[in-house]
């Protein structure tokens, strides 16, 4: 169960793994998510009632029962990791913390014009984890505009103190914003020298590379394969660093593989999970449970669903015993990696998918699309719904998208004049409006949740949730679309489609067959130029051809702007407003869904 709410003035008792310093409870939650064992945390905010040495402490916790007793304590903020909130997982943190000095090892001190320049310097410096910048108002004249680049063993501050007129923040490497670039090459039969920052066991060099990418101090790695001459070093992944940031030397070495961290790549990070299966391989570790399972795929599902499980080994059934079910060993360790890897014993091993953004119904592959057509085929957009009103007569009102088994995301402006959810019907799995008859099954709407800052479509916050009276059973023709990940804010989507039954020109009628149009995204700067009389905010996203011709129109409102990225469809926008339809140099304006992910989660998870 994904729980994103933070519990104010609440402390979880016991279960401590370790204490780190974080500038906010929100960032404490991210640190907990990426820690191999952390399930819950307690953060202490600054408060006159609390000892200043405890301010900004983030206590990472674990519990066999996945929960801990709650105690009231002023200034304490507690919560759960995002390990089961697939679309929430992102290491990217663009927040700037005012009047906080995040302490670490200062290794570079220089003058910068602004905090943004300082953050860019940190992002483009291979060793930098975070920075502190003394602003123009800093009391010490000589220290004004000084940008301090910092690093630590853990990647988090060693301490955080209040300090007027400074700002601090983190490197944006994990937001794919570093200009350092990266080496994607894997070097066979080559070993790097330099300092080892950690040693873990991995089944292959690719898992080794992912672990290196997410380790705060790993810049490159060397992996010793399972046929390496020294038995005790087989499957060893050495995470490495150097002062220069690159290996100072390398040695040709049979059965070793070396490579680099992908943290500085100008693309989103590899997912913090390993989806492959390793045949004839046993992973050793602390045993969590032994369960019967039909296949190694089923075993991986069991591991993924058990939040404390980190990896597993499946031993297939011998002959026909136990109804053909094998044994599924769910395991964990202190660092998330096996304590030993054995070969030749017949097991099939793998890792939990709980930290993949892929572990979700919304990522299931759907039918291949018909390129070039404007009419959709059945099952092509299984998240698209048609929202009908029954008053005064039944008609199509707006589009919408399935985002959960009881939730539709749509536009707030669709509900102008709608007095009650009782008059609404949601039809899913529909291709043609003509399929909707008196006896066609639909979902009643229990609740309409409109964003409380919504006034009109043109001023933003044009977003609404419909809570359905019954749950949607996912099939090929009705299933959810993934919400965009906050970590993918910098992704440039190139395969975006708008769909709906709306008008095909300004004076028209609702279409019978679901229409689709591939439309390029337009930058907000470009969009602002086309709508001088409006404010195009970062909470809006625009799409359209300069010459016009393809666009959403009346009746498409509330429907999805769906973009495919890494083979997964994401709900990037909600059809909101525009000047006319498909006019030259008038792009369509959509609600920028990534900016509302927190709002969506807050509303859909409210108890």
């Amino acid at each position: 169960e994904c729980v994103t709410q933070l519990l104010k003035d609440t402390c979880f008792e016991g279960g401590d793994i370790t204490t780190v310093f974080t500038p906010s409870a929100k960032y404490c939650q991210v640190v907990c998510t990426y820690h191999p064992r952390c399930l819950l945390f307690t953060f202490t905010a600054e408060s006159p009632s609390e000892d200043p040495t405890r301010w900004f402490t983030c206590v990472l916790k674990d519990s066999v029962t996945e929960t801990l007793p709650r105690v009231n304590r002023t200034a304490a903020i507690s919560g759960y990791s995002f390990k089961q909130c697939s679309h929430q997982i992102s290491a990217c943190n663009k927040d700037i913390y005012v009047d906080l000095d995040m302490k670490g090892i200062n290794y570079n001190s220089s003058v910068a014009k602004s905090a943004q320049e300082c953050q860019e310097r940190c992002t483009d410096d291979v060793h930098c984890h975070f920075f502190t910048y003394a602003t123009r108002q800093f009391p010490s004249l000589e220290h004004r505009n000084i940008c301090l680049l910092k690093h630590t063993q853990t990647g988090t501050p060693t301490r955080i103190t209040k300090l007027d007129k400074v700002v601090s923040g983190f490197s944006l490497k994990s937001c794919a914003l570093s200009n350092l670039g990266c080496h994607m090459n894997i070097f066979q039969h080559l070993a790097f020298s330099d300092v080892d920052v950690a040693r873990v066991l991995t089944p292959d060099a690719f898992v080794c590379r992912t672990i290196c990418t997410y380790h705060p101090n790993c810049l490159f790695f060397t992996f010793y394969t399972n046929v390496w001459k020294i038995e005790s070093q087989r499957n060893v992944c050495l995470l490495k660093t150097s002062e220069s940031g690159t290996p100072s030397s390398s040695t040709p070495q049979e059965n070793t593989i070396s490579g680099y961290s992908l943290l500085t790549c100008k693309r989103t990070l590899p997912e913090f999970c390993h989806s492959s299966f390793y045949h004839d391989t046993d992973f050793l570790g602390e045993e969590l449970d032994i369960v019967a399972a039909k296949s190694h795929e089923a075993c991986q599902k069991l591991c993924t669903n058990a939040v404390r499980c980190q990896f597993f080994t499946y031993t297939p059934a011998q002959a026909s015993c136990n109804e053909g079910k094998g044994k599924c060993y769910l395991k964990l360790s202190s660092n998330g990696s096996p304590t030993k890897i054995l070969h030749g014993r017949g097991g099939i091993s793998g890792y939990t998918l709980r930290l993949c953004k892929m572990d979700n119904e919304c990522t299931t592959k759907i039918k291949p699309r018909i390129v070039g057509g404007t009419a959709s085929v059945r099952g092509e957009w299984p998240w698209q719904v048609t929202l009908h009103t029954t008053s005064p007569t039944q008609r199509h009102l707006c589009g919408g998208s399935i985002i959960g088994n009881q939730w539709i995301l749509t536009a707030a402006h669709c509900f102008y004049g709608v007095e009650s959810p009782k008059i609404l019907r949601v039809y899913s799995g529909i291709l043609n409006q003509s399929e909707i008859k008196e006896d066609t099954s639909f979902f009643g709407v229990q609740e309409i949740i409109i964003h409380d800052q919504y006034k009109m479509a043109e001023s933003g916050y044009d977003i609404a949730l419909l809570k359905l009276e019954t749950t949607v059973n996912y099939t090929d023709s009705q299933r959810p679309i993934c919400l965009p990940s906050k970590g993918d804010r910098n992704v440039i989507y190139t395969d975006c489609w708008v769909t709906g039954w709306g008008y095909r020109k300004l004076r028209d009628k609702i279409q019978n067959t679901l229409q689709k149009a591939k439309i390029p995204l337009v930058t907000n700067e470009e969009c602002q130029k086309r709508y001088r009389g409006h404010k195009i905010t970062h909470k809006m996203i625009c799409a359209g051809y300069r010459e016009g011709g393809k666009d959403a129109c009346k009746g498409d409102s509330g429907g999805p702007l769906s973009c495919k990225h890494n083979e997964v469809w994401h709900l990037v926008g909600i059809t909101s407003w525009g000047e006319g339809c498909a006019q030259r140099e008038r792009p369509g304006v959509y609600t920028n869904v990534v900016e509302y992910v927190d709002w969506i989660l807050e509303k859909t998870q409210a108890v």
Epitope: Y107, N108, S109, F138, L141
Partner: antibody, heavy 116, light 107 residues
Framework: QVQLEESGPGLVAPSQSLSITCTVS????????IYWVRQPPGKGLEWLGM???????DYNSALKSRLSISKDNSKSQVFLKMNSLQTDDTARYYC??????????WGQGTTLTVSS | DIVMTQSHKFMSTSVGDRVSITCKAS??????VAWYQQKPGQSPKLLIY???YRNTGVPDRFTGSGSGTDFTFTISSVQAEDLAVYYC?????????FGGGTKLERL
């Protein structure tokens, strides 16, 4: 952990020059400024000068013409050079690490006696 | 150059007393003033920086206040181990400068 250690000649004849080395560990000289401060016997503290993380220097106005501060980042060493020494330069010489202009870590100091 | 003046070279106190040491700058130094404690045969130790921020591990009986040219360092309840020399220092503008020091002694 953070440490600073001064090493100097101990005794110098008048009109000679002085060279004191401050060797640091537990942090990098590229990220912190280092100060030199002296304290004559039974007297107060006198600020001599500093070298910033980026290599810039600042000196006490009265001593500027006789002072020179430099460093070797790779060796984690900071150097204080002072010429034309007089007996009133007899003092304990400290190096200290910068924290926004204050000095959060100090060395133990090295005693210099200027005497013939 | 900025001159820092500590008007009292000596101050007498008893354990448990509240004591305040003052320091005056010859020109405005904003809030960039630090306070140090020095015991015989030891290096100075940073207690307070930027007027009122306590350094790590410094007991909360030590506080600082002021801005501009007038600054005060206070020990709310003097302990035996607090008997030492206290220096103020401006870190507003180089060349940085120290006050002459105030020796806190037993009454």
């Amino acid at each position: 952990q953070v440490q600073l250690e001064e090493s100097g000649p101990g005794l110098v004849a008048p009109s000679q020059s002085l060279s004191i080395t401050c060797t640091v560990s537990g942090f990098s000289l590229t990220g912190y400024g280092i100060y030199w401060v002296r304290q004559p016997p039974g007297k107060g503290l006198e600020w001599l000068g500093m070298i910033w993380g980026d290599g810039r220097t600042d000196y006490n106005s009265a001593l500027k013409s006789r002072l020179s501060i430099s460093k070797d980042n790779s060796k984690s060493q900071v150097f204080l050079k002072m010429n034309s020494l007089q007996t009133d330069d007899t003092a304990r010489y400290y190096c200290a690490r910068d924290y926004y202009g204050s000095k959060d870590y100090w060395g133990q100091g090295t005693t210099l006696t200027v005497s013939s | 150059d900025i001159v820092m003046t500590q008007s009292h070279k000596f101050m007498s106190t008893s354990v448990g007393d509240r004591v305040s040491i003052t320091c005056k700058a010859s020109q405005d130094v904003s809030t960039a003033v630090a306070w140090y404690q020095q015991k015989p045969g030891q290096s100075p130790k940073l207690l307070i920086y930027l007027t009122s921020y306590r350094n790590t591990g410094v007991p909360d009986r030590f506080t600082g206040s002021g801005s501009g040219t007038d600054f005060t360092f206070t020990i709310s309840s003097v302990q035996a181990e607090d008997l030492a020399v206290y220096y103020c220092q401006q870190h507003y503008k180089t060349p940085y400068s120290f006050g002459g020091g105030t020796k806190l002694e037993r009454l």
